[in-house]
Structures are given as C-alpha cells and as structure tokens.
C-alpha cells in the first residue's frame, strides 16, 4: 500500500500553564531525508495551520521564531509541544507529515489529538 500512516494520541490535556505535548509517529514507506511536519487545528469545520517545520532526518525541527510550537525528532517520531494555549484553543490538533525528499513524495495525515485547555482559576485575594 503506497500510503503513509500517521499515529497520534486521541486526547491530551494541556497543563495549567497552557502547554500541551504529544507524539506524532509516522510509518515511512520510503527513506526520506527531508520531512515537513504541520500541525493543523480543526474546530467547527474550520481548519487553520498552527505551525509547520521542515527538518533533515537526524536534525532538530526548526519552527519560525514566532511559532507557538517546539519539537524534537527521533527516527520516525516527532515530539511536539504547543504553548500559550487558552480555553478557547480547545480543539482537534492534526499532525500532517510530508516526505519531501528524495522523491517520491508521500503524504500522511493523523486522525487528530483532541487538546483540552482549561484556563486556571484566578488566585483568591488573601485576607492576610
């Protein structure tokens, strides 16, 4: 089967500081040296790009300076961290993997990770 399977966890709960991490793993049908990983957010049938990075196998992922994502790679596994999340950012975060080089190109899209974000309660004023 000329397809690339992408696996990611079904659900992740963001920390109280608005940080969520998950692993995106892909079964590579070819021996790619250049890989692009994109995180898409799907909410209310709207899809937006959260972040994207292209990396050479064996090297670190490089996101843009203003990206809310960071990540590391190990073989066919990418560890993604999204920060600065608030309750309104709750949604389905989809990992998309593209094997860019050498040809042939392969596309793999995960089923998505539902990230739940709960805004922390404000600290009550102290009477002391």
């Amino acid at each position: 089967c000329k397809a690339m399977h992408v696996a990611q966890p079904a659900v992740v709960l963001a920390s109280s500081r608005g940080i969520a991490s998950f692993v995106c793993e892909y079964a590579s049908p070819g021996k790619a040296t250049e890989v692009r990983v994109t995180v898409l957010r799907q909410a209310d049938s709207q899809v937006t790009e959260v972040c994207a990075a292209t990396y050479m196998m064996g090297n670190e992922l490089t996101f843009l300076d203003d990206s809310i994502c960071t990540g590391t790679s190990s073989g066919n596994q990418v560890n993604l961290t999204i920060q600065g999340l608030r309750a309104m950012d709750t949604g389905l975060y989809i990992c998309k993997v593209e094997l860019m080089y050498p040809p042939p190109y392969y596309l793999g899209i995960g089923n998505g990770t539902q990230i739940y974000v709960i805004d922390p309660e404000p600290c009550p004023d102290s009477d002391f």
Epitope: K2, A3, H5, P29, R36, A52, M100, G108, I109
Partner: antibody
Framework: QVQLVESGGGVVQPGRSLRLSCAAS????????MHWVRQAPGKGLEWVAV????????NYADSVKGRFTISRDNSKNTLYLQMNSLRVEDTAVYYC???????????WGQGTLVTVSS | EIVLTQSPGTLSLSPGERATLSCRAS???????LAWYQQKPGQAPRLLIY???SRATGIPDRFSGSGSGTDFTLTISRLEPEDFAVYYC?????????FGQGTKVEIK
C-alpha cells in the same frame, strides 16, 4: 477570495519554448504546494509538476522531466512553468491548482491553451 | 505509479435518477487520499469529494463518496440538470499524482 489566473499560452513550433504564469491572489502562496495539471484536447487530466512551499522541493511527471521546470516567486505570489523542447503531444490546456491542507487540489485556474504545431 | 481505472466510460441517465460511478486502483490507496472532481465543457475541474467521503465546501449532499482499499464509488442520489458532466477520481497520497480516465454522465 482565492483566485488563480494562468497566462502565457499560445501556438508554438515543436522544439521551441514557452513560459506559463499563474497569478495567485486571496492567499499566501508560500504556505501552499502548487501544481500544474494539463488536459489534451478531448482527453483526461494529467499531472505535470508540483513545487512545495519555499520552492526548494519539486516533482515532475516522467513525460516532462528534463524539459519542463516549475518555479515560484512567493514575493509576487506567482507560479511558473518553463516548457522547453516542446513536442506535439504537449498540446493541452494547462491548469495551475492549489493544494489544500488535506493534500487535495481545492482551487483551479481557468486554464491556458498551449498548441504545439509545425 | 498507482493506476486508476474508472467505469463505466459513459453513463446515460435521466434527471432524477441515481448515478453510481466506480474507480478502481491498481494497488491499495488509503481512503484518506482519494478525491473526486467534476468537469463541465470549457471549465476547470471542481473538487467534489476528498478523503473518499468528505464533501468539499459548497457541494450539495446528493453527492456522496465511499470505498476503501482499491474500490471507490461516487454516488449522485438524484441527478440534477447541472450534474451532467465528466467525473474524475484522483489519488493524492504519493507522487506521481494520478487521475482516472473519467466517466461521462450524459442525458439519456
């Protein structure tokens, strides 16, 4: 709204060259893969070439490899197809098309006709 | 290269009838990466279905897609006059991107 407008088609003799352009508007070109797809008169659709994101990665159909070059100028939001050593069998309507988030071709231009004839 | 074979080549039906178009792949295609397009004379193709069964934006619900592995189907539940056109399937999971040869749906 998303719009793709091709230009540069025309009648050319075998062995000659032609450059097609596709002006994109309504979206940021650098965030999308862009393809050229062609359709010979009365025939089906045939994929020609693709350029990805920053333009560093490209793929070509075997039928055009070594003769056609796809490129993009993201600052001008324009896609190109340089066609050299044209053959009669390259006669077709050439469409530029955008790849959406899911990898599918979601928007197409109106096409530009290239006729290779002596 | 994944070869897609569509059948029948031509489908002659009347408005209001059900149309069933088939697309068979030479090797297994993930259903996530199978699309259907509609093309009318003198016009560019228009995306109908992606991921084998998801309707593109603005596509009426009389169009539906199904299938997995090597066999995929596009169904038009009740043909409207504007549905008479040529339909192409496409796989987009790996290069080279390939299309079926098309099925023409014509008025009987």
């Amino acid at each position: 709204q998303v719009q793709l407008v091709e230009s540069g088609g025309g009648v050319v003799q075998p062995g000659r060259s032609l450059r097609l352009s596709c002006a994109a508007s309504g979206f940021t070109l650098s965030r999308y893969g862009m393809h050229w797809v062609r359709q010979a008169p009365g025939k089906g659709l045939e994929w020609v070439a693709v350029t990805w994101y920053d333009g560093s990665n490209k793929n070509y159909a075997d039928s055009v490899k070594g003769r056609f070059t796809i490129s993009r100028d993201n600052s001008k939001n324009t896609l190109y197809l340089q066609m050299n050593s044209l053959r009669v069998e390259d006669t077709a309507v050439y469409y530029c098309t955008r790849v959406d988030w899911w990898g599918v071709f979601d928007f197409w231009g109106q096409g530009t006709l290239v006729t290779v004839s002596s | 290269e994944i070869v897609l074979t569509q059948s029948p080549g031509t489908l002659s039906l009347s408005p209001g009838e059900r149309a069933t178009l088939s697309c068979r792949a030479s090797q297994s295609v993930s259903s996530s990466y199978l699309a259907w397009y509609q093309q009318k004379p003198g016009q560019a193709p228009r995306l109908l279905i992606y991921g084998a069964s998801s309707r593109a934006t603005g596509i009426p619900d009389r169009f539906s897609g199904s299938g997995s592995g090597t066999d995929f189907t596009l169904t038009i539940s009740r043909l409207e006059p504007e549905d008479f056109a040529v339909y192409y399937c496409q796989q987009y999971g790996s290069s080279p991107w390939t299309f079926g040869q098309g099925t023409k749906v014509e008025i009987k």
